[in-house]
Amino acid sequence: QLPPGKPEIFKCRSPNKETFTCWWRPGTDGGLPTNYSLTYHREGETLMHECPDYITGGPNSCHFGKQYTSMWRTYVMMVNATNQMGSSFSDELYVDVTYIVQPDPPLELTVEVKQPEDRKPYLWMKWSPPTLIDLKTGWFTLLYEIRLKPEKAAEWETHFAGQQTEFKILSLHPGQKYLVQVRCKPDHGYWSAWSPATFIQIPSDFIMNDHHHHHH
């Protein structure tokens, strides 16, 4: 029987910069029941606080609700693991909420086949940013990525759309049914999950284009 091994806080995420959650990995348990506590202070403070919510984020987590989350202050936190034989501490972790945002997927993905008379046909798609993200403040830049594939294909084809919320793709296989998804990330944050798949049937008379794709 031994003191617990060193835990590691390995992940922190915020869906919208208004709340966030951090998760830790326990070290070895030393063969005894182990209690974990997360303590933190914010930049400019000396007073240490204990995690306000160990429940919401699931096992080995700490959730900071709205009243505990500040975008203006860096959080300095560590996890203490304790059993009957002793304690061990994680390394200190510094968290700036700006840099841990992982948004919800984009919304309202619509996909259409456009067949203008004077030009080659193309696949046109548009979407909306996730509702929890406030883009009006200006500091939040969302980047988008699209992926699509024929229904029975194994490999996805991905396209980076930058900050745009619409996109054209010119090169598709006629007669195929395609799955299309979109995801987003803040410039220094994390990719969202992919949006639910939208299906689109490419007409059999769709003419392949040499130019692969272009932004709208």
């Epitope: 860096t74 700006t98 840099y99 200006g138 500091w139 220094h188 994390y190």
Partner: antibody, heavy 118, light 112 residues
Framework: EVQLVQSGAEVKKPGSSVKVSCKAS????????IHWVRQAPGQGLEWMGE????????NYNQKFKGRVTITADKSTSTAYMELSSLRSEDTAVYYC???????????WGQGTLVTVSS | DVVMTQTPLSLSVTPGQPASISCRSS???????????LHWYLQKPGQSPQLLIY???NRFSGVPDRFSGSGSGTDFTLKISRVEAEDVGVYYC?????????FGGGTKVEIK
Amino acid sequence: EVQLVQSGAEVKKPGSSVKVSCKASGYTFTSYWIHWVRQAPGQGLEWMGEIDPSDSYTNYNQKFKGRVTITADKSTSTAYMELSSLRSEDTAVYYCARSFFTNWFAYWGQGTLVTVSS
Amino acid sequence: DVVMTQTPLSLSVTPGQPASISCRSSQSLVHSNGNTYLHWYLQKPGQSPQLLIYKVSNRFSGVPDRFSGSGSGTDFTLKISRVEAEDVGVYYCSQSTHVPFTFGGGTKVEIK
């Protein structure tokens, strides 16, 4: 203990490429961005770019765009910086550095001297 | 790119005496999220740089309290209240508000 251990010194010819490695240990490699910073002899520090090892998303200093490629290998917890079309002005010590969930550099590698000479 | 200008270029200080380094940026370092990402690093002779101060005035873990940072907007200062022999090296200010991140030219601190 967090460690960033870089590959050894290199001597390269003008026009060639160099690839410097940075092996991370003591933490979960995919959790934090890795940055590359260089320092020419007797000069200051210059930020080259950064990578998020979780998905290999990169941002580069436009000054190096097209010449620098930053990659990460999750299986070996190693980041790489490749600089191509080398010229004598690229002679420098190249550092990798790690952030937290922040945008400043908390841990630094020991540096790799790259000498470009004909 | 944001240009960071440090003064003085070098500083020779008697142990126990204070020292002050100034850093000026060519544009405001207030991020649109309200934070100011101005940091100070020390590069001791023959070593890699090490973080001293983050976000203007916050000492990094293990940094002695004789180091303090202040300033806002475009003008920032690093102060050492009582210089010790181990403080010798080159001090750099750095901004990470705007990409590309940039560094000042450095201030060399020597002991008299």
